[in-house]
């Protein structure tokens, strides 16, 4: 059975600032045909037929659901892109994470401006404080890491707070073993 393709993002963040660039790539097994990819944005077929879809100078209208399809293979699972206009944006490597998988959080400043005195919060409680800006790395996510995250920091010597982001960590499916 042909595998469903998978949409990946580069950079890996699905929440980006207006004006930023992101490349969506349709990955799958044995897809050698360069121009045989269909891209769907909010259900509408895109003109792009390459395996990569480049979003340059992102606009609010670029927000929404993206899916790809190779040949007559099933459509990929959807990927959701959200375009923001703000000073600070909390970005996550994924918003739904399988238990045991890594999770990365980034407090990103608009236009890549220097951000400092960064505090990450989970469910209203401060998690980490850095004078210089750093990403948070959770190497093995657990269900307890689920929650509402946001960050605060200084940009241009002024204090800002990001919009909150819900992270859900789900239990990995148990392998079933049958007695022979």
């Amino acid at each position: 059975v042909p595998q469903k393709p998978k949409v990946s993002l580069n950079p890996p963040w699905n929440r980006i600032f207006k004006g930023e660039n992101v490349t969506l790539t349709c990955n799958g097994n044995n897809f050698f045909e360069v121009s045989s990819t269909k891209w769907f944005h909010n259900g509408s077929l895109s003109e792009e037929t390459n395996s990569s879809l480049n979003i340059v100078n992102a606009k609010f209208e670029d927000s929404g659901e993206y899916k790809c399809q190779h040949q007559q293979v099933n459509e990929s699972e959807p990927v959701y892109l959200e375009v923001f206009s703000d000073w600070l944006l909390l970005q996550a490597s994924a918003e739904v994470v399988m238990e045991g998988q890594p999770l990365f959080l980034r407090c990103h400043g608009w236009r890549n401006w220097d951000v400092y005195k960064v505090i990450y919060y989970k469910d209203g409680e401060a998690l980490k404080y850095w004078y210089e800006n750093h990403n948070i790395s959770i190497t093995n996510a657990t269900v307890e890491d689920s929650g509402t995250y946001y960050c605060t920091g200084k940009v241009w010597q002024l204090d800002y707070e990001s919009e909150p982001l819900n992270i859900t960590v789900i239990k990995a499916p148990r392998e079933k073993y049958w007695l022979q």
């Epitope: 236009r111 890549n112 401006w113 220097d114 400092y116 210089e132 200084k154 241009w156 010597q157």
Partner: antibody, heavy 121, light 107 residues
Framework: EVQLVQSGAEVKKPGSSVKVSCKAS????????ISWVRQAPGQGLEWMGR????????NYAQKFQGRVTITADKSTSTAYMELSSLRSEDTAVYYC??????????????WGQGTTVTVSS | DIQMTQSPSSVSASVGDRVTIPCRAS??????LAWYQQKPGKAPKLLIY???NLQSGVPSRFSGSGSGTDFTLTISSLQPEDSATYYC?????????FGGGTKVEIK
């Protein structure tokens, strides 16, 4: 390479206003800010305020609040600093400087040549 | 306001000497500090940003160190053209403040 070119020397009467311009040549303001710094004769450097042209947001040192106005015209890549109610203590060289927010921790990496403002009756 | 203190206000040294110029912040500013050189009648020039990063085009004899409240600008081997006034500046919070300056003279 960006250069900041300031307007010429000014002689002003006490109580009047002065407006100094700062034009970016060889580049635009882009995502940078422009700070204004003054230096009285034989004295050190004093930060007055700054503007982020792309946003039109200006911030001022408390000392100058209400007396200084910093503006920018993105179309001509020019920043302006207007100081009102001039007094003799405002006699100084006024500098504009580009503030770099890209890994420079907001240091001022490009400076104008300075504009001498003399306040005298 | 964060006060920046530079002491001494002047230092005299010979060509080839190692010169250190201290700067102290009245509260912690991590690495949010810049150093500038100003020669008479000229605009200041950025030497060091983020406390220890050398600005492009600045000779490697200049270096910056420190974090928190205590910072140092070092000229490893003083040259005649280094005769100038050196200012530190904190970029952490409003109002942005400069030290009073340290004048370096050649003996």
């Amino acid at each position: 390479e960006v250069q900041l070119v300031q307007s010429g020397a000014e002689v002003k009467k006490p109580g009047s206003s002065v407006k100094v311009s700062c034009k970016a040549s060889g580049g635009t303001f882009s995502s940078y800010a422009i700070s204004w710094v003054r230096q009285a004769p034989g004295q050190g450097l004093e930060w007055m305020g700054r503007i982020i042209p792309i946003l039109g947001i200006a911030n001022y040192a408390q000392k100058f609040q209400g007396r200084v106005t910093i503006t920018a015209d993105k179309s001509t890549s020019t920043a302006y600093m207007e100081l009102s109610s001039l007094r003799s203590e405002d006699t100084a060289v006024y500098y504009c400087a580009r503030v770099n927010p890209f890994g420079y921790y907001y240091a001022m990496d490009v400076w104008g040549q300075g504009t001498t403002v003399t306040v005298s009756s | 306001d964060i006060q920046m203190t530079q002491s001494p206000s002047s230092v005299s040294a010979s060509v080839g000497d190692r010169v250190t110029i201290p700067c102290r912040a009245s509260q912690g500013i991590s690495s949010w500090l810049a150093w500038y050189q100003q020669k008479p009648g000229k605009a200041p020039k950025l030497l060091i940003y983020a406390a220890s990063n050398l600005q492009s085009g600045v000779p490697s004899r200049f270096s910056g160190s420190g974090s928190g409240t205590d910072f140092t600008l070092t000229i490893s081997s003083l040259q005649p053209e280094d005769s100038a006034t050196y200012y530190c500046q904190q970029t952490d919070s409003f109002p942005l403040t400069f030290g009073g300056g340290t004048k370096v003279e050649i003996k």
